[in-house]
């Protein structure tokens, strides 16, 4: 049965940021600020009606 | 650098995998100026069944 939703896995590097342990902890300011910026950015990119949102954001060292 | 991994959701049939990647790549310059994020090494793939539950008959 089709859900009517398509999911895409997306991965990219942010080369001007340094990874540190605070990006492993969702309660830190660094984690939350980066997550907010990325979420906002994707809402800007995929402005068209079909975009439903993003989930499962993970950060790891590059 | 920081590697970001995430899952994007779209209404079925509204975008193909090529445009997901193309639209993201075309935004990289603005991402740098607006969010101070220098983005590279973009990779996009569809999330395979069963997660996306897209095995339905046409």
């Amino acid at each position: 049965l089709s859900t009517g939703v398509s999911f895409f896995f997306l991965s990219f590097h942010i080369s001007n940021l340094q990874f540190n342990s605070s990006l492993e902890d969702p309660s830190t300011d660094y984690y939350q600020e980066l997550q907010r910026d990325i979420s906002e950015m994707f809402l800007q990119i995929y402005k068209q009606g079909g975009f439903l949102g993003l989930s499962n954001i993970k950060f790891r060292p590059g | 650098s920081v590697v970001v991994q995430l899952t994007l959701a779209f209404r079925e049939g509204t975008i193909n995998v090529h445009d997901v990647e193309t639209q993201f790549n075309q935004y990289k310059t603005e991402a740098a100026s607006r969010y101070n994020l220098t983005i590279s090494d973009v990779s996009v793939s569809d999330v395979p069944f069963p997660f996306s539950a897209q095995s339905g008959a046409g």
Epitope: - | E12, I15, N16, V17, H18, D46, G58
Partner: antibody, heavy 120, light 107 residues
Framework: QVQLVQSGAEVKKPGASVKVSCKAS????????MHWIKQAPGQGLEWIGY????????HYNQKFKDRATLTADKSASTAYMELYSLRSEDTAVYYC?????????????WGQGTLVTVSS | DIQMTQSPSSLSASVGDRVTITCRAS??????LVWYQQKPGKSPKLLVY???TLTDGVPSRFSGSGSGTQYSLTISSLQPEDVATYYC?????????FGSGTKLEIK
């Protein structure tokens, strides 16, 4: 009504270049992507690449990347495909085709085709 | 690259017959499958998109179906004007490959 009118047939020698035009009318040229397709005599269809005339963004089939250039003149509502270093296997009908607008993944209008013959 | 395997390469059928052409993709193309009809000396014409949506003005005897990697185009009752070559196309990812075509003739 939407129309894509292509330039006339061309005969070229091996090693030469050819530039095929596709004049669009009946819609806003900059809001639809224009694709180019090759059809060799008696053969099937082969996708060459596309241009987004609004942003000038192009994407090519790797097979054609080194020998084809897609451009667009917004003021003339015309898309162009230039093919370089022609060889006999480039003899084909070349079509421009408009991709439908948002979430429209198909070619809804095609040009009439331009026959390019490469012969010494 | 996604390869599109179309079969049969040619087909001869009688007026009124039910005809089915199939197209197999080498990977899941998520219903981003298009069918075109090309008559001799003419440009291709859009028939079906999103695997099963009939474009405006196309007779209802045409229908598309399938999902994942397997797709088909069916003509429920073949008419003389349906003589043409039919192509499927992957519109999921670049390069936007076409099937090799099915030449349909009337017996």
């Amino acid at each position: 009504q939407v129309q894509l009118v292509q330039s006339g047939a061309e005969v070229k020698k091996p090693g030469a270049s050819v530039k095929v035009s596709c004049k669009a009318s009946g819609y806003t040229f900059t809001t639809y992507t224009m694709h180019w397709i090759k059809q060799a005599p008696g053969q099937g269809l082969e996708w060459i690449g596309y241009i987004n005339p609004g942003s000038d963004y192009t994407h090519y089939n790797q097979k054609f990347k080194d020998r084809a250039t897609l451009t667009a003149d917004k003021s003339a509502s015309t898309a162009y495909m230039e093919l370089y270093s022609l060889r006999s296997e480039d003899t084909a009908v070349y079509y421009c085709a408009r991709q439908g607008n948002y979430a429209a993944y198909y070619f809804d209008y095609w040009g009439q085709g331009t026959l390019v013959t490469v012969s010494s | 690259d996604i390869q599109m395997t179309q079969s049969p390469s040619s087909l001869s059928a009688s007026v009124g017959d039910r005809v089915t052409i199939t197209c197999r993709a080498s990977g899941n193309i998520h219903n981003f499958l298009v069918w075109y009809q090309q008559k001799p000396g003419k440009s291709p014409k859009l028939l079906v998109y999103n695997a099963k949506t009939l474009t405006d003005g196309v007779p209802s005897r045409f229908s598309g179906s399938g999902s994942g990697t397997q797709y088909s185009l069916t003509i429920s009752s073949l008419q003389p004007e349906d003589v043409a070559t039919y192509y499927c196309q992957n519109f999921w990812n670049v390069p936007f490959t076409f099937g090799s075509g099915t030449k349909l003739e009337i017996k």
